[in-house]
């Protein structure tokens, strides 16, 4: 297992609709054809997996159908979008990148993006 540098923004504020996007960029030492990207959430010292996708270079990222994540790739950058976020989901979201094929296997873990989420104000009742 060889180490690889992964960069991501330090702090991001989600939109009022609970959507947060950020770029995860990795310094690929070689010509990987198969890449796995995992988003981990660290909160109160606990780390949980948010979503993961494996993709072939030049192809779209495919997350599971019920995943809260979507993404696109361009070269050594992965643009990740997490939706359905609420205030309780505020936390440090860490990007983990694995170059699966061809060998050697490389692993890189970013420092994390602190995503802040604020629940939208409830709409006032109307007569309509």
């Amino acid at each position: 297992c060889k180490a690889m540098h992964v960069a991501q923004p330090a702090v991001v504020l989600a939109s009022s609709r609970g959507i947060a996007s950020f770029v995860c960029e990795y310094a690929s030492p070689g010509k990987a054809t198969e890449v796995r990207v995992t988003v981990l959430r660290q909160a109160d010292s606990q780390v949980t997996e948010v979503c993961a996708a494996t993709y072939m270079m030049g192809n779209e990222l495919t997350f599971l159908d019920d995943s809260i994540c979507t993404g696109t790739s361009s070269g050594n950058q992965v643009n990740l979008t997490i939706q359905g976020l609420r205030a309780m989901d505020t936390g440090l979201y860490i990007c983990k990148v694995e170059l699966m094929y061809p060998p050697p296997y490389y692993l890189g873990i970013g420092n994390g993006t602190q995503i802040y989420v604020i629940d939208p104000e409830p709409c006032p009742d109307s007569d309509f």
Partner: antibody
């Protein structure tokens, strides 16, 4: 080195607007947020809200909602805070601060805004 | 909104003495998001401690932080003349971010 440099002191009349700038250098501007904090004479620190330089999303203090606008110009690594309909109790030193992971780690030198008729 | 309270409001001590400042949050705050700042007259605040207990770059070892959930403490082991200032705690755990009202450490 990493620093935030703010614009100079302002004197405004009640009802006017003020726009304070905060120029960042020494780091990747879009990787962090910028918060604006004010301090009235002899008082404590009040967080006015912040802007995510990465995407321009903002979160304002409820008491200032509708009067304050925070923006960024990523081409010049500069953040702006505009406060409208100024009142005498808006007289304060206004600071910008970098929002890092878990703290406001870098602060500007402060901008004195005096509201007086 | 998380309300931060600090005690005492003023602490009168002599150089060389130990200072213990308290900060309380109205609801639980992850220690990763609790910080302390020092402010001297006419100057901008300066980050001292983040993550409840980690000293910021260039901060002397006499400053230490501790605590968890709702109760946090800043300790200055031996006050130096330059340490007489106002100290603020802050949470960046939940929006909106909030500061405590401050503790003034002055010379006895």
């Amino acid at each position: 080195q990493v620093q935030l440099v703010q614009s100079g002191a302002e004197v405004k009349k009640p009802g006017a607007s003020v726009k304070v700038s905060c120029k960042a250098s020494g780091y990747t501007f879009t990787s962090y947020g910028i918060s604006w904090v004010r301090q009235a004479p002899g008082q404590g620190l009040e967080c006015m809200g912040w802007i995510s330089a990465y995407n321009g999303n903002t979160n304002y203090a409820q008491k200032l909602q509708g009067r304050v606008t925070m923006t960024t110009d990523t081409s010049t690594s500069t953040a702006y805070m505009e406060l409208r309909s100024l009142r005498s109790d808006d007289t304060a030193v206004y600071y910008c601060a970098r929002v890092g992971i878990g703290a406001f780690d870098i602060w500007g030198q402060g901008t004195m805004v005096t509201v007086s008729s | 909104e998380i309300v931060m309270t600090q005690s005492p409001a003023t602490l009168s001590l002599s150089p060389g003495e130990r200072a213990t400042l308290s900060c309380r949050a109205s609801q639980s705050v992850s220690s990763s998001y609790l910080s302390w700042y020092q402010q001297k007259p006419g100057q901008a605040p300066r980050l001292l401690i983040y993550g409840a207990s980690t000293r910021a770059t260039g901060i002397p070892a006499r400053f230490s932080g501790s605590g968890s959930e709702t109760d946090f403490t800043l300790t200055i082991s031996s006050l130096q003349p330059e340490d007489f200032a106002v100290y603020y705690c802050q949470q960046v755990y939940n929006l909106p971010f909030t500061f405590g009202p401050g503790t003034k450490v002055d010379i006895k």
